[in-house]
């Protein structure tokens, strides 16, 4: 059974240019993590293996810095960068977890940025 | 720390058979696949054959298939590989190692962690 | 069966000088490539994976690069202990997966 839960930074906003950390965090389970994939859209952007480390697909590899932690940080936005991030949570029993974070990048240089949870 | 523990090496005449053992620790074993890769004295590295997590999809090189068995023990945290009609050519040190990948995150067949090795070796 | 083929066999490098070792595979592997480091008694050490992306623990000074059909594996600046045998690995994603030759890395 399932039981853990996956926290994310949720809705986020950035300034064109800038750069944002995507963070999830899995909670409320004992299950071991093998892997954690961050996509954008149907793209792989990185993979975190427990034996291999990170892995920056090479496509993102100029704008996509690994860390902090499990996170992933996103540099030089452009309007493109707008959209839907998901991390998926490879764990062992459970299976496989599932956080969305939704960014949106502001020409403006006013970007609010949405409710963020710090990670002890 | 992941630790692999191969065992069950040693001299066997033509034709005949071995298993070998390759004991697990440091890790959760079994949602890992697995692997057997061979490297003959003064020669490069083979891949031999690999085994799911659950141990549901099993692979071979051609030059083992029909002849070699991989399988697992998840509840003693030990791969296993019998080696049947044992020709000279199979003559080797023999690894298991640890896939980085699961079931659930698919796998790559690329190995970080490795035993120490265990040699075979096939002659009258 | 997809053949990787290593070149040179031997090379012969003075420490500190920089190392080009080269992996050629018979049919694309697109980037499903390792290189793998082995001394003498030992079992083989995975430097990279993925042609380009280092496994963890492993030294700036290994780089790896290509994909399709040609990789390189290059060491900027040879350390003592880096003087082995490094061979390639293709894993496209059904067996078998082969290894290269190999490459001797030895001292000038």
């Known amino acids: 059974m399932m039981t853990g839960t996956i926290e994310t930074t949720g809705n986020i906003s950035a300034e064109k240019g800038g750069s944002i950390i995507l963070q999830c965090h899995l909670s409320s389970t004992t299950a071991q993590v093998t892997q954690v994939n961050w996509e954008q859209q149907d793209q792989l952007l990185a993979i975190c293996n427990a034996d291999l480390g990170w892995h920056i697909s090479p496509s993102f590899k100029d704008r996509v810095a690994p860390g902090p932690g499990l996170g992933l940080t996103l540099q030089s936005l452009t309007v493109n960068d707008t959209g839907e991030y998901f991390c998926i949570y490879h764990t062992y029993p459970d299976g496989t977890y599932t956080g969305r974070i939704f960014l949106e990048v502001l020409e403006s240089s006013v970007a609010e940025h949405g409710a963020r949870f710090q990670i002890p | 720390e992941v630790q692999l523990l191969e065992s069950g090496g040693g001299l066997v005449q033509p034709g005949g058979s071995l298993r070998l053992s390759c004991a697990a620790s440091?890790?959760?074993?079994?949602?890992?696949?697995m692997s057997w890769v061979r490297q003959a004295p003064g020669k490069g590295l083979e891949w031999v054959s690999s085994?799911?997590?659950?141990?549901?999809?099993?692979y071979y090189a051609d030059s083992v298939k029909g002849r070699f068995t991989i399988s697992r023990d998840n509840s003693k945290n030990t791969l296993y590989l019998q080696m049947n009609s044992l020709r000279a050519e199979d003559t080797a040190v023999y690894y298991c190692?640890?896939?980085?990948?699961?079931?659930?995150?698919?796998?790559?067949?690329?190995?970080?962690?490795w035993g120490q090795g265990t040699l075979v070796t096939v002659s009258s | 069966e997809i053949v990787m083929t290593q070149s040179p066999a031997t090379l012969s490098v003075s420490p500190g000088e920089r190392a080009t070792l080269s992996c050629r595979a018979s049919q694309s592997v697109s980037s499903n490539l390792a290189w793998y480091q082995q001394k003498p008694g030992q079992a083989p050490r995975l430097l990279i994976y993925?042609?380009?992306t280092r496994a963890t623990g492993i030294p700036a000074r290994f780089s790896g690069s290509g994909s399709g059909t040609e990789f390189t594996l290059t060491i900027s600046s040879l350390q003592s202990e880096d003087f082995a045998v490094y061979y390639c690995?293709?894993?496209?994603?059904?067996?078998?997966?082969?290894f290269g030759g190999g490459t001797k890395v030895e001292i000038k």
């Open positions: 190692a640890k896939d980085p990948g699961t079931d659930s995150s698919g796998y790559y067949y690329i190995w970080r962690y």
């Open positions: 690995q293709q894993y496209v994603p059904h067996p078998p997966f082969t």
């Open positions: 085994i799911s997590g659950s141990g549901g999809r099993t």
């Open positions: 440091g890790f959760t074993f079994s949602p890992y696949g």
């Open positions: 993925s042609a380009s």
